[in-house]
Amino acid sequence: SSSPTSSASSFSSSAPFLASAVSAQPPLPDQCPALCECSEAARTVKCVNRNLTEVPTDLPAYVRNLFLTGNQLAVLPAGAFARRPPLAELAALNLSGSRLDEVRAGAFEHLPSLRQLDLSHNPLADLSPFAFSGSNASVSAPSPLVELILNHIVPPEDERQNRSFEGMVVAALLAGRALQGLRRLELASNHFLYLPRDVLAQLPSLRHLDLSNNSLVSLTYVSFRNLTHLESLHLEDNALKVLHNGTLAELQGLPHIRVFLDNNPWVCDCHMADMVTWLKETEVVQGKDRLTCAYPEKMRNRVLLELNSADLDCDPILPPSLQTS
């Protein structure tokens, strides 16, 4: 145990000219890497907006919160944070906005206390299926991660590999069943068109799921049944047209759930009747009085809660011989 007195070393900002002096020696307890700012009392290291191209090797052993935001890391290799001795205390790692386009298998290995990881605002064209699990075993050692923040990680269209982006992300989430303890998952702003049907069933500990600002059209094949701990489900700003009976029943069956559905292009025709009835009765939808129709044109901006069955009709589909030109 230590009994530190206040000293200048507890908060230091290393000068740029020391950048080449990175040592392979084990770091001193109060050493602060070049281009970083350290506070031992807050157990925090901030290497922010410094155009770093790799993770500093000489991170202090006390680091519990590591901010590596606004850099130019490009690739996160296997064992990017592996140190001898290991960074046993590191609990929160923020790599947002650091121009990462590749995260390799085992990038976060040897971080036994890592609870919160933020990779947001990186154009992840290549996210290894084993980025979070560390191995390609069918069942990996459980990851300590509790919060995984992956907002706006979709790469530009021309940088995407010839595979489904949704599939790539989901493969990383499900590999080796390593993320069984995950409680918060944020996947906002990723242009997701669909949610693979098996993803939620394998994340049974989820309490908070954010899928806002995507392009989800339907939840028909998505099951929420296993997510008995789910407390918040953010589906704002998607392309949802209607929620069908199966989805409504599953959401209603979750004991602690709050659902956010604002700014979706709801289609107010005969298929909407069940959802309107449910909305009028349910307490789980936050701000349900703000939900409005987008289509058909005659229903635009009508409030869903104010509709009745007579408002919700489907134009008859005429047989071809009776259709006019």
Partner: antibody, heavy 122, light 107 residues
Framework: GVQLQQSGPELVKPGASVKISCKAS????????MNWVKQSHGKSLEWIGD????????TYNQKFKDKATLTVDKSSSTAYMELRSLTSEDSAVYYC???????????????WGAGTTVTVSS | DIVMTQSPATLSVTPGDRVSLSCRAS??????LHWYQQKSHESPRLLIK???QSISGIPSRFSGSGSGSDFTLSINSVEPEDVGVYYC?????????FGAGTKLELK
């Protein structure tokens, strides 16, 4: 919810020792440092030190390093502080406190126990 | 040790007033400054972390500003229940230290 339940008031004689407890619930005990803070009557707050429940590593305020000993029992999610060689100056309310609502972040306290009053008197 | 100096020691206010409490650190602590409210016979309660970050469940009338060594806690429209002692805390360097407090009372 997240709670820290402290042991009851103590009346002790000068020169004696006392061990007070703080039982955590509603979060993973080993995820967050446990801090101890002293508040003498009508006075401000003084940080005594903290302990990492995961490995028992402690950090003390120099002022209290010969006065307080911090320990934990992981099996019962309980933190302890022993105060020794007590004098009237040690009469105060002692709080345990942690940052248990927020992963990772340290150096501030968003969950506090109700406090344990220690009175040193002959 | 970093010394935290709060002013004024006491502030007498009328409900609806906008008030500012000052805290000065004896050396720069970046934004590692936290504010607490303590009502009579209660434990302290975190109001603001990292100089200006709001805390869930704390009324929006409480806000913080500052960086380096000068910090301010503002209450934009004081309510009667805001009476108590307000402490600032250095969360930057060991040992963690608190100011002596500003007592907020009603006129």
């Amino acid at each position: 919810g997240v709670q820290l339940q402290q042991s009851g008031p103590e009346l002790v004689k000068p020169g004696a020792s006392v061990k007070i407890s703080c039982k955590a619930s509603g979060y993973t005990f080993t995820d967050f440092y446990m801090n101890w803070v002293k508040q003498s009557h009508g006075k401000s707050l003084e940080w005594i030190g903290d302990i990492n429940p995961n490995n028992g590593v402690t950090t003390y305020n120099q002022k209290f390093k010969d006065k307080a000993t911090l320990t934990v029992d992981k099996s019962s999610s309980t933190a302890y502080m022993e105060l020794r060689s007590l004098t009237s100056e040690d009469s105060a309310v002692y709080y345990c406190a942690t940052g248990a609502i927020h992963y990772g972040y340290d150096g501030y306290f968003d969950v506090w126990g109700a406090g344990t009053t220690v009175t040193v008197s002959s | 040790d970093i010394v935290m100096t709060q002013s004024p020691a006491t502030l007498s206010v009328t409900p609806g007033d906008r008030v500012s409490l000052s805290c000065r650190a004896s050396q720069s602590i970046s934004d590692y400054l936290h504010w607490y409210q303590q009502k009579s016979h209660e434990s302290p309660r975190l109001l603001i972390k990292y100089a200006s970050q709001s805390i869930s469940g704390i009324p929006s009338r409480f806000s913080g500003s500052g960086s380096g060594s000068d910090f301010t806690l503002s209450i934009n429209s004081v309510e009667p229940e805001d009476v108590g002692v307000y402490y600032c805390q250095n969360g930057h360097s060991f040992p963690l230290t608190f100011g002596a407090g500003t007592k907020l009372e009603l006129k």
